[in-house]
Interface confidence: low
């Protein structure tokens, strides 16, 4: 398969595979290579609630309970991201593992990571049977952490 | 820059322009992709001790308290990783910001992260001037989280 | 402005118990601990304990345990110390604070508590 | 318990001049590079007021001629130059750890 920089892809390399394969074995495999979350998403109804459990995945035990929602796109590498959604607007207690403790807010951790969506060539002969990528900062929740209020102005 | 994709290289989309290119400046411009962690490092240092700020970054607001870890390889995609290192054991009090409380653990989320190492291509005329990307799995620890240690079997 | 208004004065049988209240305004009430602290007379100053009236989680000097609950009601902003089985050497005056960092930033105005036959 | 040992019991000092306070702890009172002992103030018929929280940050409101020093077990209240209202009961506080432990104080009076 015949690949090719586009210069009109922000420069970045580009793979401009025959449209024929569209979507051709290589490209699923490649986009499908991160699929899963870093905990995993079989456990995820654990945190559900304003809890922290004792047992289970860290985004169920963390007193910043999350869980995670997935968000796919086949033209995008990779095709899943999972976003982390905080269950608490606060701390739960490490007491209890259930009161929320009013002294710590449960925060999303941000992330620009980079992911490349599969754009049509410019500029190619044929253009109508080549894409290529092209690369793009994409923000993502990784995980929600509990954290002291900021000091108010 | 003609690309090919290397059957050698796990069966995913490889890119071998030139060695006379090397490191082409695509390649600099792409590999270089990700180069900061989820927070300013500028800000790391009041996180050197474990103790959770009233302000600053979450990482060292967070009650689990994490400085960064800069991982680079110039010969991967990303070129720059960064590895939270948690610097506390336990997690910070709330109310005091400084005191661990032993109710709770400070403990790494890791990743399975999506990566591309440029390796030399495989079967290919003239080898020694093209190079393929191998897709890897590669651990990195995001964050540092509080949670409730796990109940004792 | 941050208040903390304490209930008056307060003359008990040994063995009778008291229960003092200390009422906050001017800030977030469930968000900071209140911290009973308690000075006889010419003497100096003491902690009794502490309560984070957000979750009810209270901490309490293991001198006064068993003798003293504290409680709060967040609807009224109000902190409450209970001290049982009152002797003569509980005569003292009582304050709250407000606490952040375990001490004591704005105080009641004391609340004079005596423990006479 | 962390008992806190302050001296002297008490001191006289002529306005403008110097008054300096120590208190001194039974074992350390650090932790993770904060040092949990503070200052309070208190005058007859009055509860008592912060004046220096964590060793040496001064509390909002009060005069730069409050300061605070030391670590680990060795802290000291310095007062300078001492004014006439600085007539007052002093005391330290620990906070490093439970039960939260007083000084016997020091009382200050001018000459």
């Known amino acids: 398969v015949s690949l090719r920089i586009q210069e009109g892809c922000s420069h970045l390399p580009s793979c401009c595979p025959s449209k024929e394969q569209e979507p051709p074995e290589e490209w699923l495999k490649w986009s499908s290579a991160s699929v899963s979350p870093p905990e995993p998403l079989s456990h995820t109804h654990h945190a559900e609630s304003c809890r922290a459990s004792k047992d289970g995945p860290l985004n169920s035990r963390a007193i910043s309970p999350w869980s995670y929602e997935l968000d796919r796109d086949l033209n995008r590498v990779p095709q899943d991201l999972y976003h982390a959604r905080c269950l608490c607007p606060h701390c739960v207690s490490l007491q209890t593992g259930s009161h929320m403790d009013p002294l710590g807010n449960s925060v999303p951790l941000y992330h620009n990571q980079t992911v490349f969506y599969r754009r049509p060539c410019h500029g190619e002969e044929g253009t109508h049977r080549r894409y290529c990528l092209e690369r793009r900062l994409y923000r993502v929740s990784l995980a929600c952490v509990c954290v002291r209020p900021r000091v108010m102005a | 820059v003609s690309l090919r994709i290397q059957e050698g290289c796990s069966h995913l989309p490889s890119c071998c322009p030139s060695k006379e290119q090397e490191p082409p400046e695509e390649w600099l411009k792409w590999s270089s992709a990700s180069v900061s962690p989820p927070e300013p490092l500028s800000h790391t240092h009041h996180a050197e001790s474990c103790r959770a700020s009233k302000d600053g970054p979450l990482n060292s607001r967070a009650i689990s308290p994490w400085s960064y870890e800069l991982d680079r390889d110039l010969n991967r995609v990303p070129q720059d990783l960064y590895h939270a290192r948690c610097l506390c054991p336990h997690c910070v009090s709330l109310q005091t910001g400084s005191h661990m409380d032993p109710l709770g653990n400070s403990v790494p989320l890791y990743h399975n992260q999506t990566v591309f190492y440029r390796r030399p291509c495989h079967g290919e005329e003239g080898t020694h001037r093209r190079y393929c990307l191998e897709r890897r799995l590669y651990r990195v620890s995001l964050a540092c989280v509080c949670v409730r240690p796990r109940v004792m079997a | 402005q941050v208040q903390l208004v304490q209930s008056g004065a307060e003359v008990k049988k040994p063995g009778a118990s008291v229960k003092v209240s200390c009422k906050a305004s001017?800030?977030?009430?469930?968000?900071?601990?209140i911290e009973w602290v308690r000075q006889a007379p010419g003497q100096g100053l003491e902690w009794i304990g502490q309560?984070?009236?957000?979750?009810?989680?209270?901490n309490y000097n293991e001198k006064f345990k068993g003798r003293v609950t504290i409680t709060a009601d967040t609807s009224t902003s109000t902190v409450y110390m209970e001290l049982s089985s009152l002797r003569s050497e509980d005569t003292a005056v009582y304050y709250c604070?407000?606490?952040?960092?375990?001490?004591?930033?704005?105080w009641g105005q004391g609340t004079t508590v005596t423990v006479s036959s | 318990d962390i008992v806190l040992t302050q001296s002297p019991a008490s001191l006289a000092v002529s306005p403008g001049q110097r008054a300096t306070i120590t208190c001194r702890a039974s074992e350390s009172v650090d932790s993770y590079g904060n040092s949990f002992m503070h200052w309070y103030q208190q005058k007859p018929g009055q509860p008592p007021k912060l004046l220096i929280y964590r060793a040496s940050n001064l509390e909002s409101g009060v005069p730069a001629r409050f300061s605070g020093s030391g670590s680990g077990t060795d802290f000291t209240l310095t007062i300078n130059p001492v004014e006439a209202q600085d007539t007052a009961n002093y005391y330290c506080?620990?906070?490093?750890?439970?039960?939260?432990?007083f000084g016997a104080g020091t009382k200050l009076e001018l000459k």
């Open positions: 604070a407000r606490g952040y960092g375990n001490y004591g930033d704005y």
């Open positions: 506080q620990q906070s490093n750890e439970d039960p939260l432990t």
């Open positions: 001017g800030y977030t009430f469930s968000s900071y601990w």
């Open positions: 309560i984070l009236p957000g979750i009810g989680s209270t």
